[in-house]
Interface confidence: medium
């Protein structure tokens, strides 16, 4: 067991080196270990191959580090990795696209406030168990088209406080089981009427606190299974243009916050769901 | 001033189920977590689980994995508490307790609710 | 059997010095902080210390933690009697992956 480190057995075979300054991954980890955990060091560097020779590592947490660089070989070997945690990394910003490949059992990746400005092409292929993926709190502007592709089983999709200017048509294409969705505090001012085609499973949609001024309901269409829907705090334009969102709100089954108008001037701060159709004129 | 305004007190019969429900004010209820925390008399707090709103999961105590589901209602900012199976030693109070959410795991608890005793008596 | 083990009882004089340990281990406070909480007759816990040594507003300065490898420590200096209460610690553990509590000190002004 390495110097700076508890080994123990039980209930898994676990490395536990936490908090204790470690400045690089420690050398010794026991290959039979399932459970890493070097959060709260000073790591600043994953090297390739970093755990090889713990072929039965089903948990690796190295949150709140200072991971500036990881290379693409560090997670190689890893085939019964189950969760990865490379969160509270500000330095970190960009992923080799190839870091998660082989990755094929992983199920919840945290990336979260990685200071992360893009994600690659390719960067989330294969990893088809994915079911939580923790993207919120960077500096993300972009979607790009087909990113989340090959994640059949995500549920879970954490997109809030980034700086996202659009959904693009194909930014969530193959999503098919997602059940949640959070985009809110970002930047988002236009939604492609059929960037949520592959959503038919998503509960719950968080879109608030962005510069939506409109969105069509033809995105929102195929939402079937949508319960619970936030559009708050966002530029709502309450014209003759809102009069889809707003049949398409008094027919929704499930709960939804306010949608509070910003224009024009008489209908500020009214919400758009109480408002009668004949409010919604000019254009 | 936050509150958690918890259901009211229950008896029920061994082998039934209980579910209790803890509704928070203001509207900042999806940012928190919400831990459900009990205290049988004469005995120490127990965590039986909780469930962070805006992530959509519940994560339970090793010892109420198999009997517990703990729900959250965003739309009415009510967390649920259901205990099945009931039997005579899990006659406790039971407390519903709002957290900061900090990172995925069950941070302190600094908003408590005034707890729900619940007895089981044949 | 509680996972953090605490002594059952405490007692002091009004103003004296109290300390309530904490003793735990490598998976839970050697790895995460420790919280303290008090239980005065008949209501809710209240949280006294968070992140091992932070107080939240409102609770005094005669309250105060610290934690120390896999042990934490809550020191309550210039005791009053308003302070009989139950006193718990509390942590996360990697483990058991769930939140721990000790067994609760009862604290006597005598």
């Known amino acids: 067991c390495p110097g700076a480190c508890v080994c123990y057995n039980e209930p898994k075979v676990t490395t536990s080196c936490p908090q204790q300054g470690l400045q690089a991954v420690p050398v010794g980890i026991p290959a039979a270990s399932q459970r890493i955990f070097l959060h709260g060091n000073r790591i600043s560097h994953v090297p390739a191959a970093s755990f090889r020779a713990c072929r039965n590592l089903t948990i690796l947490w190295l949150h709140s580090n200072v991971l500036a660089r990881i290379d693409a070989a560090a997670f190689t070997g890893l085939a019964l990795l189950e969760q990865l945690d490379l969160s509270d990394n500000a330095q970190l910003r960009s992923v080799d696209p190839a870091t998660f490949h082989g990755l094929g059992r992983l199920h919840t990746l945290h990336l979260d406030r990685c200071g992360l400005q893009e994600l690659g092409p390719g960067l989330f292929r294969g990893l088809a168990a994915l079911q939580y993926l923790y993207l919120q709190d960077n500096a993300l502007q972009a979607l790009p088209d087909d990113t989340f592709r090959d994640l059949g089983n995500l549920t879970h999709l954490f997109l809030h406080g980034n700086r996202i200017s659009s959904v693009p048509e194909r930014a969530f294409r193959g999503l098919h089981s997602l059940d949640r969705l959070l985009l809110h505090q970002n930047r988002v001012a236009h939604v492609h009427p059929h960037a949520f085609r592959d959503l038919g499973r998503l509960m719950t949609l968080y879109l608030f606190a962005n510069n939506l001024s409109a969105l069509p309901t033809e995105a929102l269409a195929p939402l079937r299974a949508l319960q619970y829907l936030r559009l708050n705090d966002n530029p709502w334009v309450c014209d003759c243009r809102a009069r889809p969102l707003w049949a398409w709100l008094q027919k929704f089954r499930g709960s939804s916050s306010e949608v509070p108008c910003s224009l024009p001037q008489r209908l500020a701060g009214r919400d758009l769901k109480r408002l009668a159709a004949n409010d919604l004129q000019g254009c | 001033e936050v509150q958690l305004v918890q259901s009211g007190a229950e008896v029920k019969k061994p082998g039934s189920s209980v579910k209790v429900s803890c509704k928070a004010s203001g509207d900042t209820f999806s940012s928190f977590g919400f831990s459900w925390v009990r205290q049988a008399p004469g005995q120490g707090l127990e965590w039986m689980g909780g469930i962070i709103p805006m992530y959509g999961t519940a994560k339970y105590a090793q010892k109420f994995q198999d009997r517990v589901t703990i729900t959250a209602d965003e739309s009415m900012s009510t967390v649920y508490m259901e205990l099945n199976s009931l039997r005579s030693d899990d006659t406790a109070v039971y407390y519903c307790a709002r957290g900061p959410l900090v990172r995925y795991y069950f941070y302190y608890m600094d908003v408590w609710g005034r707890g729900t005793m619940v007895t089981v008596s044949s | 059997q509680s996972v953090l083990t605490q002594p059952p009882s405490a007692s002091g004089t009004p103003g004296q010095r109290v300390t309530i340990s904490c003793s735990g281990s490598?998976?839970?406070?050697?790895?995460?902080?420790v919280n303290w909480y008090q239980r005065l007759p008949g209501a809710a816990p209240q949280l006294l210390i968070y992140n091992n040594d932070q107080r939240p507003s409102g609770i005094p300065d005669r309250f105060s933690g610290s934690r120390s490898g896999t042990s934490g420590s809550l020191v309550i200096s210039g005791l009053q009697s308003e302070d009989e209460a139950d006193y718990y610690c509390a942590s996360w553990d990697d483990s058991l992956n769930g939140r721990v509590f000790g067994g609760g000190t009862k604290l006597t002004v005598l």
């Open positions: 490598s998976s839970n406070i050697g790895s995460n902080t």
